[in-house]
């Protein structure tokens, strides 16, 4: 946020940039949290825009019994590995086809034991405040589906009649990692020393990091004709004086008519 300065007073302004603002020859360049000619004002809204999507990664191991392990499968650039990857990916795409969050699989390692496939199942969902629940549910469905397929697609008399067959007991879920996104934490951090006064409110499922000085939210402070200003002790209303009235009170709701004061009378509305 920048405010431009013209005229002779600019040199003086340069040395007075506050709150870590820097002079660029024309104006104070303010850090994210501040604005104003001297960076003296605290912003009332901080952009903590969430990522468009949130990802999860499940580390799984399955044992493929319909393929015999050969040394070439250790080499990820070999034709054998590439063919295995292709078939395994096709098979897993079928297994997980009903899961909207499913993105694909990534083989990390193949090892002996028929073929033990260490791989990641990749999940992704659009960001909503309920993303954790959505991804938790998806990981449960992944577990159900892989358990089912590795129980059903098995070798009979050393022959597999499916694209791939599995060892029922060789299926394991090692780890589940969900990209963490905590808007409240981000809001607190970005608000720095004002963190106690900034809160997250949702509008159309999007989080907004705001102070009570930001209008239009449930926490917004109504300063009436005054101006809301953030200080280290919290939001405060700076009351205005008009041609006819002085305003006072915590929310500038007490108006005193000047003419009455001059006539030694107080009148509140």
């Amino acid at each position: 946020r920048t405010t431009t300065c013209f005229g002779d007073g600019c040199q003086n302004t340069a040395s007075r940039c506050k709150n870590g603002g820097t002079w660029d020859g024309l104006k104070c360049q303010c850090p994210n949290l501040y604005y104003g000619e001297l960076c003296e004002e605290v912003v009332s809204s901080i952009d903590i825009g969430p990522p468009e999507t949130i990802s999860a990664q499940m580390e799984l191991t399955v044992t493929v019994t319909s393929v015999k392990f050969t040394e070439e499968l250790k080499n990820h650039s070999s034709q054998e590995f590439q063919e295995f990857k292709q078939t395994f990916t096709e098979q897993m795409n079928i297994v997980y086809s009903g899961i909207p969050e499913y993105v694909g699989v990534n083989i990390t390692k193949l090892r002996l034991g028929s073929v033990v496939v260490e791989h990641d199942v990749l999940l992704r969902t659009k960001y909503t405040p309920e993303y954790k629940t959505v991804l938790d549910n998806a990981t449960e469905v992944v577990k159900e589906k892989i358990t089912k397929v590795t129980t059903q697609q098995i070798m009979i008399n050393d022959i597999c009649s499916d694209m791939m067959c599995f060892n029922t007991t060789g299926t394991q879920v090692q780890n589940i990692t969900v990209t963490q996104y905590d808007p409240e934490e981000d809001c607190r951090k970005m608000a720095k020393e004002y963190g106690d006064y900034f809160v997250v409110e949702y509008r159309d499922q999007k989080p907004y990091c705001i102070s009570p000085c930001e209008p239009g939210f449930s926490v917004s402070k109504n300063c009436n004709l005054g101006k809301c200003q953030m200080s280290l002790s919290g939001p405060q209303c700076l009351c205005v004086t008009t041609e006819t009235h002085w305003y006072s009170g915590e929310t500038c709701n007490q108006g005193t008519q000047k003419s009455l004061v001059y006539g030694h009378h107080h009148h509140h509305h």
Partner: nanobody, 123 residues
Framework: DVQLVESGGGLVQPGGSLRLSCAAS????????MAWFRQAPGKEREGVAF???????SYAESVKGRFTISRDNAKNSLYLQMNSLRAEDTAVYYC?????????????????WGQGTMVTVSS
């Protein structure tokens, strides 16, 4: 590029014999798995027999004892000797291959395919 070309199909009387061949180019026939599949009109493609790089073979129940699969690594070729042929053996026969040591008769596991050769068993 892998190319598989089948030959040897034709018309034969019930009880007769045929030998199908599959010439593989760009495919190391000493590796992986080679197989024969067939598809009768209006039916799904089914596995007939496969042979692995170590010579291990497997056959569909319907052809056991009548058909023999073999491969000649020196000639990069696959063969299917078909004896005691029946009317129900009528189909297009396909040669298929995989670089992997497979133990499956599912067509989806085989990435390389020939164009097929027609076998008709009829009197």
């Amino acid at each position: 590029d892998v190319q598989l070309v089948e030959s040897g199909g034709g018309l034969v009387q019930p009880g007769g014999s045929l030998r199908l061949s599959c010439a593989a180019s760009g495919f190391p026939s000493s590796r992986g798995t080679m197989a024969w599949f067939r598809q009768a009109p209006g039916k799904e493609r089914e596995g007939v027999a496969f042979i692995n790089s170590d010579g291990r073979t497997s056959y569909a129940e319907s052809v056991k004892g009548r058909f023999t699969i073999s491969r000649d690594n020196a000639k990069n070729s696959l063969y299917l000797q078909m004896n005691s042929l029946r009317a129900e053996d009528t189909a297009v026969y396909y040669c298929a291959a995989s670089l992997l040591y497979l133990m499956t008769v599912n067509a989806a596991a085989y990435p390389y395919w020939g164009q097929g050769t027609m076998v008709t068993v009829s009197s």
